[in-house]
């Protein structure tokens, strides 16, 4: 049984050019988290393997650089970048943790970060 | 250059156990991630296990109960046992290196491959 | 395990002609695929990762395409020495698994 829950930044804003951490947490279970994959839509942003450590998609090399921790910070940031994040939690023997970001980014200086939130786990297996 | 070399048996009696060697010049194994890959005759090939630049390990699920891979740095080697063979166990056996920070699980260096019968 | 389906198993075309190979992965990878390239009597070698970039020395002919759960590796116009299997992997999660191969033969 999955007991465990995964806490996001939940939603966040960000100015045009500047530069936001995603980060994500898992927690309320004893599961070894195997892999962590950064991902946008069909996009794979980084993968987090906990033997090999980071790689970031090349597509996005110039752009987003590891951590911290689990999380991932996006640099040089445009209003294209706004829309979902997920932090998809690799581990054994529970299965998938997927959490998920939402990021505005502004034209404008008015940019705040959204409050912490806790959402419901989602899984599925391999 | 990077350069592997599989060496080993070409011949393992069945319920014993498999063992090869693969050495590495041209590039440190205490960098980057070191595999075992193998391809039964007429079959897909099949992700072994790693064993990472810190010595850590990974074995695929289906394998995990007889595969032990491990590495001797002072050679510059690394080596593959698998326990209680069977002619499922027929391959040839590629060893491999993995650069993950830049190309995530895609293998990028291979060894030349060895065969490995397993019959009576 | 995430099954890598490839089609065509082989696939005649002619020097010059394009080549297109499929892979289907059961469930979405996003972009974190492989295609390499096996001739007789040699080991794999690597042709494209994360879906369509080219690894170093990859001749242009050869394009990777797609993402989630169909994939594409092209060859725009076959050589004779493009004959070979070509396998795709991918590397989302652990174990990371392989297709089939698809045999490329000349007309």
């Known amino acids: 049984m999955m007991t465990g829950t995964i806490e996001t930044t939940g939603n966040i804003s960000a100015e045009k050019g500047g530069s936001i951490i995603l980060q994500c947490h898992l927690s309320s279970t004893t599961a070894q988290v195997t892999q962590v994959n950064w991902e946008q839509q069909d996009q794979l942003l980084a993968i987090c393997n906990a033997d090999l450590g980071w790689h970031i998609s090349p597509s996005f090399k110039d752009r987003v650089a590891p951590g911290p921790g689990l999380g991932l910070t996006l640099q040089s940031l445009t209003v294209n970048d706004t829309g979902e994040y997920f932090c998809i939690y690799h581990t054994y023997p529970d299965g998938t943790y997927t959490g998920r970001i939402f990021l505005e980014v502004l034209e404008s200086s008015v940019a705040e970060h959204g409050a912490r939130f806790q959402i419901p786990h989602h899984h599925h297996h391999h | 250059e990077v350069q592997l070399q599989e060496s080993g048996p070409g011949l393992v009696k069945p319920s014993e156990t498999l063992s090869l060697t693969c050495a590495v010049s041209?590039?440190?194994?205490?960098?980057?991630?070191w595999n075992w890959i193998r391809q039964p005759p007429g079959k897909k090939l099949e992700y072994i296990g790693y064993?990472?630049?810190?010595?850590?390990?990974y074995y695929n699920p289906s394998l995990k109960s007889r595969v032990t891979i491990s590495r001797d740095t002072s050679k510059n080697q690394f080596s593959l046992k698998l326990s209680s063979v069977t002619a499922a166990d027929t391959a040839v056996y590629y060893c491999?290196?993995?650069?993950?920070?830049?190309?995530?699980?895609?293998?990028?260096?291979w060894g030349q491959g060895t065969t490995v019968t397993v019959s009576s | 395990d995430i099954v890598m389906t490839q089609s065509p198993d082989s696939l005649a075309v002619s020097l010059g002609e394009r080549a297109t190979i499929n892979c289907k992965a059961s469930?979405?990878?996003?972009?974190?695929v492989a295609w390499y390239q096996q001739k007789p009597g040699q080991s794999p070698k690597l042709m494209i990762y994360?879906?369509?970039y080219r690894y170093t020395g990859v001749p242009d002919r050869f394009s990777g395409s797609g993402s989630g759960t169909d994939f594409t590796l092209t060859i725009s116009s076959l050589q004779a020495e493009d004959v070979a299997v070509y396998y795709c992997?991918?590397?989302?999660?652990?174990?990371?698994?392989f297709g089939g191969g698809t045999k490329v033969e000349i007309k």
């Open positions: 064993i990472s630049y810190s010595g850590n390990t």
């Open positions: 994360s879906a369509s």
């Open positions: 469930q979405n990878v996003r972009t974190a």
């Open positions: 992997q991918q590397y989302y999660t652990t174990p990371w698994t």
């Open positions: 041209g590039y440190s194994i205490t960098s980057d991630s």
């Open positions: 491999a290196r993995l650069d993950f920070s830049n190309y995530g699980g895609a293998v990028d260096y």
